[in-house]
Interface confidence: low
């Protein structure tokens, strides 16, 4: 505890200027006071002033009024500070002395003489109210007041409760009359050291270091820290927990950046061709007649369909073509012959059959040859029979389609989904990617195919120290600690700036 016993000397009367021994002061009693404050004694005895003592300078001669002074010599009220719990009782001895010596420090002068003394014993509660008294003896009268008040920062009935108002990171409060704390606006907690965050700031996902603030923990964003941050690089997806990337419709892949509906999103096929989706970023354009190219962007020559028969050569003309027929043929496409079987028109072992009474003929071609004169070797790939980007290959008398990944069928017309065989266990969600399927696992499972059962929540045991945030499913250990500033280590257990002798260094 800590307080001050204050004694206010008001008036001293010694009209005859007499000492206690009956002698008179010459030229007058130059009066100073000695005060002794001690614990309560039923009978006041000599001995140490256990609660303190103080002396005044010379305050006047014989009779005088004592003026209040707050500083300097002759301070009044007189201050008797104590550094213990005020017991509520006391004994007080006030002595008036005459000094022939120094005004300011009469204590040190030889030849001081007692004028009078009074003794007060009793109880006194802490408070601002002055208790006023007056003591008389045959020669003198002393008017005075006294009280006990607590020192700055001490409170309570016995000045035993210490409370220092403060406004720093250890607390933000003022002191109540009883010494209890009264938090400044915006602060709460036992020591008023916890800021009251922005109203609505998410209790778990947000925090603050000063009032009306909302700072987001890792993985969260927004004014109130109630919006999760998706996985870094997530293009066309959302999250319901941090670092998730749940793809929007039509998108796939870990980062939802693989277009599952390229035809709709990009319309790559030109000139009225038909677009077919074929996996992430995959598509095929089926061209209308007269167009070619990956996107059907190239217009074909009028001769591209080889309209001239019997070896006729084709010449492009504006909006049309013209066939130059070889000897023995005529017609728009050189389809009419002037030859007969007698001219041996059939090549490659073709058999000649006369028609129209021998005025024309027809060749019957052996396998792998075609044309009106069996002059062309059959190419079974010319009709582009393979769909979805399949490669056509001639294999002797037949041809085969070599399909791109994800397609099957004789003409690669069937789309195979990697997810069709349900590779994801325990209800995992499957995503078709170019390099194979990827599974998004439900809570409690992990692994490439969701085949590993997580037997417990790795964060439940609170493995992270020093206020670090715990996340699961991001590492082989099944948890990751996100350290606050100033800490490192797999569990954030080591403060930054360790002494060199410390056995672990990040």
């Amino acid at each position: 505890g800590s307080g001050i016993f204050q004694l206010r000397l008001q008036e001293f009367v010694n009209q005859r200027g007499m000492l206690a021994n009956g002698q008179s002061c010459e030229p007058g009693c130059r009066t100073f006071f000695r005060i002794c404050l001690k614990h309560f004694q039923a009978t006041f005895s000599e001995g140490p002033c256990t609660f303190g003592n103080v002396s005044t300078p010379v305050l006047g001669t014989n009779s005088f009024v004592v003026r209040d002074k707050n500083s300097g010599s002759g301070r009044n009220p007189l201050q008797l500070p104590f550094n213990f719990t005020w017991p509520g009782t006391f004994s007080l001895n006030i002595q008036a002395w005459h000094t022939p010596g120094d005004d300011l420090r009469p204590e040190t002068s030889p030849g001081n003489s007692l004028i009078s003394q009074i003794i007060i014993q009793g109880s006194l509660a802490v408070g601002k109210i002055w208790r006023t008294d007056e003591q008389n003896d045959t020669l003198t009268r002393l008017s005075y007041s006294y009280r006990v008040i607590c020192s700055d920062n001490y409170y309570g009935e016995s000045c035993s409760r210490l409370c220092k108002k403060r406004d720093d990171h250890f607390g933000h409060y003022e002191c109540q009359p009883d010494g209890s704390l009264s938090c400044l606006p915006g602060w709460t907690g036992k020591y008023c050291d916890q800021p009251i965050c922005l109203s609505g700031c998410h209790e778990q996902n947000g925090y603050c270091s000063k009032p009306d603030e909302c700072i987001c923990r890792p993985g969260w964003q927004g004014r109130l820290c109630n919006e999760c941050i998706p996985h870094n690089g997530c293009r066309h997806g959302t999250c319901s927990i941090p670092w998730q990337c749940a793809c929007d419709e039509g998108w796939g892949g870990l980062f939802c950046d693989q277009d599952l509906n390229y035809c709709t999103h990009h319309s790559p096929c030109k000139n009225g061709s038909t677009c077919s989706n074929s996996g992430p970023k995959g598509y095929t354009c089926t061209c209308l007649p007269g167009y070619t190219g990956e996107h059907c962007e190239l217009g074909l020559s009028k001769c591209a369909s080889n309209p001239c028969r019997n070896g006729g050569s084709c010449k492009d003309q504006e909006n049309s073509y013209h066939c130059l027929c070889p000897p023995g043929y005529y017609g728009q496409h050189c389809e009419h012959s002037t030859l007969t079987c007698a001219d041996s028109p059939c090549f490659n072992g073709g058999s000649c059959r006369e028609r129209n009474q021998g005025s024309s003929y027809a060749c019957e071609c052996p396998p792998n040859f075609t044309g009106s004169n069996c002059e062309k070797k059959v190419d079974r790939c010319t009709s582009n029979p393979c769909a979805n980007g399949g490669q056509c290959q001639n294999r002797g008398p037949s041809r085969t389609c070599r399909c791109r990944p994800g397609f099957t069928g004789t003409h690669c017309e069937l789309h195979i989904s990697d997810c069709a065989r349900s590779p994801c266990a325990h209800g995992g969600t499957c995503h078709d990617l170019e390099n194979g399927p990827v599974c998004t696992c439900p809570a409690g499972f992990s692994g490439r195919r969701c085949e590993v059962r997580i037997t417990h929540d790795a964060c439940a045991s609170g493995p992270c120290f020093n206020g670090a945030t715990c996340y699961t499913g991001l590492s082989p250990n099944n948890f990751v600690c996100n350290c606050p500033y100033g800490f490192v280590g797999s569990r954030c257990e080591f403060p930054v700036g360790l002494p060199p002798s410390f056995p672990w260094v990040a």
Epitope: R8, E11, F64, V65, D68, S71, T132, S143, S145
Partner: antibody
């Protein structure tokens, strides 16, 4: 309830001495609880403390006026007085007497109604 | 000589709080009194010893003193509080008044 009343001439010539008396009624001037003071206020301006006295006669003066001021007490008449010498027009003011309470930290808890003193030839 | 400085004027709406400051070097170590003076009247003590109210002074008057500044606060100001206000302290043996503040 204690009352204070100033009295004295309302007009003083320059270089002369201004003299005022304050009469205390409803209470004794013989008390160690009080000082008896003089304060003045030039027209339209603020208050200026002149000085005070205890009933024992101890006096305290404003340093800026000390050379010209004398305050005295007459306990038999329950009065105290102010004398201000060598006055000039700058001394024209309303002069108040007041009781300064020791228990109030020297606060003036009772004032006279004031008297206007004009310094003019 | 010791000086006490006050703002010349303070305006306040009825019912609002008026704060009048009084500044002086080390003022927190001295007892400060505050006086109210209405036109044509004598000053009236409203605060003594920094924050104490004499009997008869309304509770809406309060005072504080720390550092180099003492403050008189009138909460819930009423029309009757319109007046000049002076702070006063004791420097050594002499009384010193502030320059005064007109509260309207």
């Amino acid at each position: 309830e204690v009352q204070l009343q100033e009295s004295g001439p309302g007009l003083v010539k320059p270089s002369e001495t201004l003299s005022l008396t304050c009469t205390v009624s409803g209470g004794s001037i013989n008390s160690g609880n009080y000082y008896w003071g003089w304060i003045r206020q030039p027209p339209g301006k603020g208050l200026e403390w002149i000085g005070d006295i205890s009933y024992t006669g101890s006096t305290y003066y404003n340093p800026s006026l000390k050379s010209r001021v004398t305050i005295s007490v007459d306990t038999s008449k329950n009065q105290f007085s102010l004398k201000l010498s060598s006055v000039t027009a700058a001394d024209t003011a309303v002069y108040y007497c007041a009781r300064e309470d020791v228990m109030y930290g020297g606060g003036g808890d009772s004032w006279g109604q004031g008297t206007l003193v004009t310094v003019s030839s | 000589s010791y000086e006490l400085t006050q703002p010349p004027s303070v305006s306040v709406s009825p019912g609002q709080t008026a704060s009048i400051t009084c500044s002086g070097e080390g003022l927190g170590d001295k007892y400060v009194s505050w006086y109210q003076q209405k036109p044509g009247q004598s000053p009236v003590l409203v605060i003594y010893e920094d924050s104490e109210r004499p009997s008869g002074i309304p509770e809406r008057f309060s005072g504080s003193n720390s550092g180099d500044t003492a403050t008189l606060t009138i909460s819930g100001t009423q029309a009757m509080d319109e007046a000049d206000y002076y702070c006063q302290a004791w420097d050594s043996e002499a009384g010193v008044f502030g320059s005064g503040t007109k509260v309207t």
